[in-house]
Every structure is written in C-alpha cells, then in structure tokens.
C-alpha cells in the first residue's frame, strides 16, 4: 500500500505532505487547512500542468474569507519547477491568510513575475527563507519578488542562491528587515558581498550571517559592509576559511561600533585574526586551529570569549596550575 | 622548571643608561608575553608595560612611556629593560613577570604566574 | 587609569586569628583581581587570581571574594610563614594594568 501523501500530528500543529507520485492526488493537502505549519514537498514536479487547470488572473478575493480562516502561520514548499505565474497566484491568494513565514527550497521558477496589480495587497511576511531557489530572470529576482510582499519583512533568508548578487537598482528598500542571512553561498566571496548588499537597501539589519560565503578576511568583510552602509549588531563568520593577517596593502577598516558580538568559530584560524573590533560583548572563536594562548594585544575587549575546542586548550596539554587555560568544556568540533 | 633569571644589580650615575636582562627557561618563550614591574624602596608594585613575544611590540604604562624601552633576542629566550637618561627616581627593583592566559567558560585573563628575583637599580652621583 | 587602593595599609596580628584586607577599584572591574604576597627581599607570589581562584599550591586558608569595584582577600587561619606585603592588582581583561598600595601583615 502507498504511504498517505500527508501528516498531521496528533496537535493538527505540523501537516507534512511528500507527494513524490507522477500524477499525485493534491487534495490530500486538504488535510492540513487545520495546521499552523504546513509543508509541501512535490517531489521534484513540474507545476507547468497546474496552469491549465487554474486560472492564475482570477480574482484572489474571492477566497478571501477560506484563506483568512486558515491557521497556518508558517509555510514550507520544496522540491518543484514552479511558473512564475503560478508563484504570484499562490501569493496573491496567501495574502488573505495570516501566513508570517514562508520557505521555499529546491525550487525552480520558470518564466517572468508578472507586476503587482494596482489593487493587489502584498503578502505581509515577517521571515522569508529561500534555499536552492533558481529563477529564469537572473538578478533581478529579488526585486521581482518584492513587489508581492509588503515592506514589513524582517528576516530574509537567501542559501545556495544560484544568483546571490541582485540588480540593486531595482530592489527597493527593506525598512524593517533585522536578519540577513546569505549562508551556504561559497561562491559569494567578498567582492559578491559588496554587490549582494545593497548600499542603503537595508538600513535596519542587525544580524547578518554569512557562514560557508567564500569570505576570506574579517577585513574584507568590514569593507563590504562599510561600503554598503550596514552596520550589523550581529556578525556571523563561521564557517569560513579565514586568513588571519591582513594585506599591508590594503587599507585598514574601521568596524561599525554597533557591531557587538562575532562569531568565527570553525574558520580554520590559527591565530586570532588582526583588525578586528577594539570591543565586542561576545566574540566566538571555538573549533579554531589556534595553538597558542593569545597575549593581550591580539584579543580585543570582550564580555563574553568562546575559545572551546582550540588545540592550545585541549585536555592533556600540560597546564601550569589546574583550571589554566581549560574551560573544561570540549566541544564536538 | 620555569625560570626567569634576572641580570645582577647596578649602580649608575643619573643621565647615564642602563640595560637589564631577563631570560627565561622551562617554557615556549614566545608563548606567554612579558612584563615589566617597578618597585622603589619601601614602596609598592608599579606596573610599567609589556612586550608580545610574537611581534616584539611593546606596550607602556604612562609613567614609562619617554626614557624606558622593552626589546626581545627571541632566539636566547630574552627580554630586555632599557632605561636611558637616568635620574635619582629610578632607582628602584625591577622585576621581569610572564602574563599566563587563563579562559574557563567565556571569562578571560591573564596573571603573573612567574617572576625574576628582580634587578636593583641604583642611581647616585 | 583604573586605581586600586588597598586598605588598611597594615595589620598586626596574631598566629592563629583570620586576618581581612579590602581593594576598592576605582571602576567596575568585574571579577579581573588578582592578589600576590610579597615576602622581604623575594618577588611577589600569585595567591588567587579573577578574585576568587585560589592558584595551585596555595593553602585554602587563602580566599579572595568580590566583583565590580569592591574585593576582599582573607586568612583565615594566619601563620607565621604569612608575614608579607599583599597587594591587588586589577587585571582587566586589556592592559593597563595597576597595582593597589598594598597591606603589611605585621606580628602583634
């Protein structure tokens, strides 16, 4: 017997469906209009079909008062070639509904995006996570995109972006997005940083993340972001092949003084990178290669140190008193 | 054993200028950097700077910031104290101490865990 | 600069009684004090170090206790052996560093 294409839990809070059949029975999905988080994984389909069976023009008001009754908070959709068309009338549609997160992976979009009708609402999204998203109009992509979500979005999550780098002049502003993360894009490298952040397209970032993103120096990455006018609260480098020294020829950087907190734990590091912030409340540099205790010039002042899982603090390395340079806490690095 | 060996004790007339050796033993001297402390007679400790073994970068405190001068000979596992232009002020102990790091659960710092047996300096015309 | 200062600057005392010396930082240090003993003609000994750590070796009649800006190091059984100057030291987790002006422990 073939396994039920959908789950919901024993809450009606988490409805999974895999629809991995050639011609799958998509009403199944109707089991999960009760659930809070859904997710639909279409088993690498082409949704070209779909088109013909939908009308995609259709006034989406007409489903208003269905889709505002439905519970769901958080959306996932993976594993399908989409048309773009079909993109925007599932968000016009969702735009009714009190949809706060969406995430999409391992998605192909087809076609062009269509613009936003004078009379169409944008879909008010507080998260959105993109992952593995191909899209037939290259970099402007994201801009394509915006149009269709209301300025509200707060955390933008774009991995394995086959275009990480966006065509700036059309993406408009995102007032109220306070997390970034281009994690999972090894080739972004620094100078795909500076063309990703958009300068003054991001006034309100606090977090950004760029584990496994190519970065190359610590340096590097605070001239991208002085560059591009951002000024994180919150930085995350790990992840990365980090060089420790900075090339004398390259100009020094001054750190943004909002920055207070530093992760570069697992970047292969084996001193404590030069130019860094001259005071951070927390500053992680666990499952680094760094051999030797720092001196005091080469740590800046920090409220809160992560060295766990260094060779220089590995048990059994002869200690001068107990307690000495081992915080006891080996992680698995 | 760790060692700091400190060179013996001089007597200088003021202008003149002196040099004092530290060197040390028992452990990875450019592993731990070094410092510097002032003690006059009947008086307390007095902080005066250190040099980072890796770079040879000193750091002074702001009363030894003009006359005094750290250096290394990494190769003979040695710090050096120069003091130039000599005044009756300065005669005092001077002792070389090594700055152990210590880090357990996100706290930090660093100690003096090993001392020389110092270096009196006298300074009379 | 952050200035120590140490107080009383002696104490007269006898074998046997608990004997409390106080450093008073003249800014939050947080826990960044260490306390040394210095005997006549030697140099000075780690005792504790981040105010309550006793370093090896050292008896546990030996306890360090505060943070922020007050911190308190105390015998609590003195021997003769502990006759010494003990000094404070403020060990920010970035130098400068400084010194208070330290406590003589005298026989009664």
């Known amino acids: 017997t073939t396994p039920e294409p959908c789950e919901l839990d024993d809450e009606d809070f988490r409805c999974v469906c895999n629809f991995s059949e050639p011609q799958p029975d998509w009403s199944e999905a109707f089991q999960c209009v009760s659930a809070v988080e859904v997710e639909i994984h279409a088993g690498g389909l082409n949704l070209e079909p779909f088109l013909k069976r939908v009308d995609a023009d259709a006034d989406p008001r007409q489903y208003a008062d269905t889709v505002k009754a439905l519970r769901v908070r958080r959306l996932t959709v993976g594993a399908a070639q989409v048309p773009a068309q079909l993109l925007v009338g599932a968000l016009r549609v969702l735009a009714y509904s009190r949809l706060k997160e969406l995430t999409l992976e391992d998605l192909k979009i087809t076609g062009t995006m269509p613009p936003l009708p004078l009379e169409a609402t944008g879909l008010a999204l507080s998260s959105l996570r993109l992952r593995n998203v191909s899209w037939a109009t290259g970099r402007s992509w994201l801009a394509e995109l915006q149009q269709w979500l209301k300025p509200g979005l707060k955390v933008l999550s774009i991995a394995q972006a086959h275009s990480p780098a966006f065509s700036c002049e059309q993406v408009r502003a995102f007032p109220a997005l306070t997390s970034l993360d281009l994690s999972d894009n090894p080739g972004l490298g620094e100078r795909g940083l500076m063309a990703a952040l958009c300068p003054h397209k991001f006034p309100a970032i606090q977090n950004l993340a760029l584990r496994n993103t190519g970065m190359e120096t610590p340096t590097g990455v605070c001239a991208a972001l002085a560059a591009a006018g951002v000024q994180p609260h919150s930085l995350d480098l790990s992840h990365n092949s980090l060089r420790a020294t900075v090339n004398p020829s390259a100009p020094r950087c001054m750190w943004s003084s909002a920055l207070n907190s530093l992760n570069l734990s697992f970047a292969g590091l084996e001193q404590v990178p030069k130019g860094l912030p001259a005071k951070l409340r927390v500053l992680d540099l666990s499952c680094n290669r760094l051999n030797r205790a720092p001196q005091p010039d080469e740590l800046p002042e920090v409220d809160n140190l992560t060295l766990d899982g260094n060779p220089f603090l590995v048990p059994g390395t002869a200690l001068p008193h107990e307690g000495s340079m081992n915080s006891g806490v080996v992680p698995a690095c | 054993q760790i060692q700091l060996v400190q060179s013996g004790p001089e007597l200088k007339k003021p202008g003149e200028s002196v040099k004092i050796s530290c060197k040390a033993s028992g452990y990875t001297f450019t592993d731990y950097a070094m410092n510097w402390v002032k003690q006059a007679p009947g008086n307390g400790l007095k902080w005066m700077g250190w040099i980072n073994t890796q770079t040879g970068k000193p750091t002074y405190a702001d009363d030894f910031k003009q006359r005094f001068v750290f250096s290394l000979e990494t190769s003979a596992s040695t710090a050096y104290l120069q003091i130039n232009n000599l005044n009756i002020e300065d005669t005092a102990t001077y002792f070389c101490?090594?700055?152990?790091?210590?880090?357990?659960?996100?706290?930090?710092?660093?100690?003096?865990?090993?001392w020389g047996p110092g270096t009196m300096v006298t300074v009379s015309s | 600069d952050i200035v120590m200062t140490q107080s009383p600057t002696s104490i007269s005392i006898s074998v046997g009684e608990r004997v409390t010396m106080n450093c008073k930082a003249s800014?939050?240090?947080?826990?960044?004090v260490d306390w040394y003993q210095q005997k006549t003609g030697q140099s000075p000994k780690l005792l504790i170090y981040k105010a309550s750590n006793r370093y090896t070796g050292v008896p546990d009649r030996f306890t360090g206790s505060g943070s922020g800006t007050d911190f308190t190091f105390t015998i609590s059984n003195m021997q003769a052996v502990d006759l010494a100057v003990y000094y404070c030291m403020q060990s920010n987790t970035n130098p400068p560093w400084t010194f208070g002006g330290g406590t003589k422990l005298e026989l009664k």
């Open positions: 101490t090594r700055s152990t790091f210590y880090y357990s659960s996100y706290i930090y710092g660093w100690y003096f865990d090993f």
């Open positions: 800014q939050n240090v947080g826990s960044n």
